[in-house]
Interface confidence: low
């Protein structure tokens, strides 16, 4: 049914879906704090621009009786139930923030006539790619795939002189929401990653992974997995690893590698960690102080969603344009706005661009060091450490196929 939007006459409302099922197990109170912090910033920016308007958020909670698993598995209907609740209350804002689960976002996008923008902190899966009124503020699986293909093909760096075309992917089904969809994208037979690789096998059992580490007949030296160092240790322990094995550990939303006092454990020496470039130090200042590094990124995405709305609202109001139009709904893409910890760039499809960082463990210092960075906006790799102190022979990454290149 047609729901009137509280989005005119100097009063602009944001509908925030507070779903029990979420991409990260973050207390809803922390997300409220993030939204409120964002509102404060937006109000100040609008006031600085001489726009005397009111911006508020309405938090829409699900009843929690039916959808109470807490993770994303039962989220498909929760988003639709919340939309029904909004519809019944005739209370829709100018923009919808949430949901974060791929299942619920996909279903909501499918089942509603979206004439308003939807901003998500999550929705990592490929099924949420290329949605005209959906904006995603945490790196989606497509961005990871493009990095991996770019890195696999790279062969002109002092520390990587071979193109790779093979990989194992470890995926045991217990992953967090972000990892689940990242690995799902790598597993998919029709994905860009699968299309570009000559060989790819998914390892689903711990034993399969453990056996590959020393298997002389392995088809690839490269294993991709997703999670933190503790997750890797639980799986790998102190087992011996063939010297030409390279483990790519995808751990995007974890700032801990950059903390001054962090020492890399010994089991990380064969590992390249893919993470995101850490933000501005002001992130330690306010709403995020008591959040874990991962949860900080999640709450930050909510906050940045508010700032994005404020950015677009300011532009449209300054141009005297109507907010409740398809033009507004489709405008949340191909732009850069001032986020909480610096500029945030959205690509042509409304997905956040970022700087991914590939780290290695220095055998000299036992510290994580930046090997290279990758700009998702231009799909380009920038080497940082031209003479890395690798564990691998000749301080070069081995070939991906056993028996060729430095062993």
């Amino acid at each position: 049914s047609q729901v009137s939007q509280n989005c005119h006459n100097g009063s602009y409302e944001i509908s925030v879906l507070m779903m029990g099922n979420s991409a990260f197990a973050e207390p809803l109170k922390n997300l409220e704090d993030a939204v409120n912090e964002g509102l404060e910033i937006v109000r100040g920016r609008l006031q600085n621009a001489g726009l005397n308007v009111t911006v508020n958020a309405t938090f829409m909670y699900s009843d929690g009786l039916i959808h109470n698993s807490g993770d994303c598995r039962s989220s498909t209907c929760e988003g639709l139930d919340l939309l029904r609740k909004i519809s019944n209350a005739q209370r829709m804002g100018c923009v919808l923030i949430g949901p974060s689960c791929t299942y619920s976002t996909f279903q909501m996008y499918l089942d509603t006539e979206l004439s308003y923008p939807m901003i998500s902190a999550g929705s990592f899966g490929l099924s949420c790619d290329y949605k005209e009124t959906l904006t995603r503020l945490m790196s989606p699986a497509r961005k990871l795939m493009y990095f991996l293909v770019n890195f696999w093909k790279t062969n002109d760096l002092p520390f990587k002189t071979y193109s790779w075309s093979t990989s194992y992917v470890y995926k045991n089904g217990t992953e967090t929401e972000d990892c689940f969809w990242y690995l799902n994208a790598l597993e998919a037979s029709v994905s860009y990653f699968s299309h570009e690789l000559g060989f790819k096998v998914v390892l689903r059992q711990d034993k399969e992974f453990q056996d590959i580490l020393m298997d002389h007949n392995r088809k690839s030296n490269v294993i991709i997995m997703c999670g933190g160092p503790e997750f890797l240790y639980k799986l790998k322990g102190d087992r011996a690893v063939a010297e030409d094995i390279v483990i790519i550990l995808v751990d995007l939303f974890n700032d801990q590698y950059f903390e001054d006092n962090v020492t890399a454990p010994d089991y990380m020496k064969n590992v390249l960690v893919l993470t995101l470039s850490p933000g501005n130090s002001l992130l330690n200042s306010s709403f995020s102080r008591n959040l874990s590094p991962t949860k900080r990124d999640f709450a930050l995405a909510y906050l940045n969603g508010i700032l994005l709305f404020g950015h677009m609202l300011k532009i449209f109001l300054e141009n005297g344009e109507n907010i409740t139009t398809p033009k507004f709904a489709h405008a949340f893409r191909n732009l850069t706005f001032e986020g909480y910890d610096g500029p945030v760039t959205l690509d042509d499809w409304g997905d956040v661009d970022s700087t991914m960082v590939l780290l290695y463990t220095s055998v000299d210092t036992k510290k994580y060091k930046v090997l290279l960075t990758y700009d998702t906006h231009v799909n380009k790799t920038y080497p940082v450490d031209m003479s890395p102190t690798f564990t691998w022979k000749n301080s070069k990454l081995p070939n991906d196929i056993t028996g060729r290149g430095p062993q």
Epitope: N280, L282, N284, S285
Partner: antibody, heavy 119, light 107 residues
Amino acid sequence: QVQLVESGGGVVQPGRSLRLSCAVSGFTFSNYGVHWVRQAPGKGLEWLGVIWSGGRKDYNAAFISRLTISKDNSKSTVYLQMNSLRAEDTAVYYCARHGTYPYWYFALWGQGTLVTVSS
Amino acid sequence: DIQMTQSPSSLSASVGDRVTITCRASQDISNYLNWYQQKPGKTFKLLVYYTSRLQSGVPSRFSGSGSGTDYTFTISSLQPEDIATYFCQQGKTLPFSFGQGTKVEIK
């Protein structure tokens, strides 16, 4: 007009506490964070802490054990409570409204209230 | 914590002179540098924020520049009403910190 007015200053004995008030008018109190800054005689400025619009607080680590900032939205007033005062806490205490992110400036200051710690 | 070093601590100049004050941060503050004026017996007034942005209503003779750790505040033509102490402040990270101040007098 837009203003912040501090009160509660005066002479306090060492070891005692003080509670200063900052009454805000002329703007929507609940939309802004309010900072406390002090200026000791002949010395520089020290940032003490802030209470954000949603009620969250950040303190200068040097004062965190004896400083409490609070507010009453209904009275549009922010409070600074400081315990275990010593002579070096003698200063003019200012409240200030914070500016718009990302610039983090003090957009507007009160006139200050003098606190003298002396026996 | 970030330390701010401001110089000179005082200066004396004639009306019409160009006056320059510098502020150095102990680490890169990414242009999050603000300047305030405190006239004798009065409170503080924001003049310049984010290195070079002039606060509304502030005369154009005041300006700021700089990057990284080094910043400059300039009064292009000193006026009698500019007698005051000027402070820099970093807004890069908490706790916010200030320079020690520069007292400007007329010769």
